[in-house]
């Protein structure tokens, strides 16, 4: 879980390590802070649950490019 | 942290084309979203265009829709922006930029610059 004590530098210290359903998520955003130990991804579900997780995995990748998708018609 | 580094600017005469280039440091690559933004003198920042991380998708502002084109390499850590026929009205100094959450064409939605580089079409 994210974890934001010394707000306002959030971060990631354990991924989850279950694929999530696009369809539970409502956003994300980028963790690159140089003081969190790990770059990370934290999406947000439908019901205001943040889980963090591995930007290299490409599930991660694709549910990211989704989420944009949703917010945007492509002009492939 | 992604450090970005544009090629590409020049003078042209309308009609002609141009190709940019941004390649990018870091180990990530693929799993940021890429845009292009332009800024023209006394303007604002202004979305161009942006691309998915699997580069499936390309999304474009209306005023380069058909002429403009963006494309990336995963494997070379490197984005591109085809411009052709282009107009005056396409001066500006060019970005491009690597995502930090959802919103694609908003500035902020973007948390890596490059430096950016000189686009001059003269009539």
């Known amino acids: 879980q994210p974890d934001a004590i010394n707000a306002p530098v959030t971060c990631c210290y354990n991924f989850t390590n279950r694929k999530i359903s696009v369809q539970r998520l409502a956003s994300y955003r980028r963790i690159t802070s140089s003081k969190c130990p790990k770059e990370a991804v934290i999406f947000k579900t439908i019901v205001a649950k943040e889980i963090c997780a591995d930007p290299k995995q490409k599930w991660v990748q694709d549910s990211m490019d989704h989420l944009d998708k949703q917010t945007q018609t492509p002009k492939t | 942290e992604v450090q970005l580094v544009e090629s590409g600017g020049g003078l042209v005469q309308a009609g002609d084309s141009l190709r940019l280039s941004c390649a990018a440091s870091?180990?990530?690559?693929?799993?940021?979203?890429m845009g292009w933004f332009r800024q023209a003198p006394g303007k604002e920042r202004e979305f161009v265009a942006a691309i998915s991380r699997s580069g499936a998708s390309a999304y474009y502002a209306d005023s380069v829709k058909g002429r403009f084109t963006s494309s990336r390499d995963n494997a070379k850590n490197t984005v591109y922006l085809q411009m052709n026929k282009l107009k005056p009205e396409d001066t500006a100094v060019y970005y491009c930029?690597?995502?930090?959450?959802?919103?694609?064409?908003?500035?902020?939605?973007?948390?890596?610059w490059s430096q950016g580089t000189q686009v001059t079409v003269s009539s």
């Open positions: 930029a690597a995502s930090s959450r959802i919103g694609v064409d908003d500035p902020e939605a973007y948390g890596y």
């Open positions: 870091g180990r990530t690559f693929s799993s940021y979203r």
